[in-house]
């Protein structure tokens, strides 16, 4: 099975790795801009230069292309939490990220916000933090782990999800009440 | 057993409103975030907005900030998500999720869904 190719992939293909098809001529192929670059206007003709223009501020291109505008730098999200790691350039766009100790997580593909490593008080680190990953903690004995924290054993209530991981304490307190009675 | 029941879908003109609702039960509800997730015909599921255990934080994705609000009510233990101005495109089946955070899935409970059809 041959796999379906837009009318953009059909053109390209016909001609040599770093060109493109003349869009009004099929007998020419054009030379690419180089990123960092657009398409101004197309080759006039064989062997001659296509007309390529730098991207202006706050636009770029990342790889060879014939496109007639750059692309728009992305911007960071503040309400996300994420911050600058690069600025945007001709050729590279924005590069965004977290905070030192945050870890990132996706809503979407590609639309992350960022969120505070937990830093396994009332327990050991079993995992160190990660770009994509918050710290996997083991928590003490007494504790219970809720949203990965270690929380105290005093905080869980009968038949909640602690109810097992806290099962001394709580039968401790069960025969305190016991005993208390006649 | 963590249960999500959803309730308030149905059918709605362009422009109108509806509230849905979830109520939870088997889990500590003020603990974790919790919020909508949506899956609209022949398309996958996709995070609507999200809110923390105390309320204090809130996502929305960016085709529905503005016109849908997220709230809970942690003594009842219910999650709701008003949404007005409706529009054809957010037709789609309506999951009540407990988020997840930290890596991995991107929730670990999701009740049955509720059905919010938007059309003339």
């Known amino acids: 099975l041959v796999p379906h190719l837009g009318d953009r992939e059909k053109r390209d293909s016909v001609c040599p790795q770093g060109k493109y098809i003349h869009p009004q001529n099929n007998s020419i192929c054009c030379t690419k801009c180089h990123k960092g670059t657009y398409l101004y206007n197309d080759c006039p003709g064989p062997g001659q230069d296509t007309d390529c223009r730098e991207c202006e501020s706050g636009s770029f291109t990342a790889s060879e292309n014939h496109l007639r505008h750059c692309l728009s730098c992305s911007k960071c999200r503040k309400e996300m939490g994420q911050v600058e790691i690069s600025s945007c350039t001709v050729d590279r766009d924005t590069v965004c990220g977290c905070r030192k100790n945050q870890y990132r997580h996706y809503w979407s593909e590609n639309l992350f916000q960022c969120f505070n490593c937990s830093l396994c008080l009332n327990g050991t680190v079993h995992l160190s933090c990660q770009e994509k990953q918050n710290t996997v903690c083991t928590c003490h004995a007494g504790f219970f782990l809720r949203e990965n924290e270690c929380v105290s054993c005093s905080n869980c209530k009968k038949s909640l999800e602690c109810t097992k991981l806290c099962l001394p304490q709580i039968e401790n307190v069960k025969g305190t009440e016991d005993s208390g009675t006649t | 057993e963590v249960q999500l029941l959803e309730s308030g879908g149905g059918l709605v003109q362009p422009g109108g409103s509806l509230r849905l609702s979830c109520a939870a039960s088997?889990?500590?509800?003020?603990?974790?975030?919790m919020g909508w997730v949506r899956q609209a015909p022949g398309k996958g599921l996709g995070w609507v907005s999200a809110i923390s255990g105390s309320g204090g934080s809130t996502y929305y994705a960016d085709s529905v900030r503005g016109r849908f609000t997220i709230s809970r009510d942690n003594s009842k233990n219910t999650l709701y998500l008003q949404m007005n101005s409706l529009r054809a495109e957010d037709t789609a089946v309506y999951y009540c999720?407990?988020?997840?955070?930290?890596?991995?899935?991107?929730?670990?409970?999701r009740g049955q869904g509720t059905l919010v059809t938007v059309s003339s």
């Open positions: 088997g889990f500590t509800f003020e603990w974790y975030w």
């Open positions: 999720a407990k988020v997840k955070l930290g890596g991995g899935p991107n929730f670990d409970y």
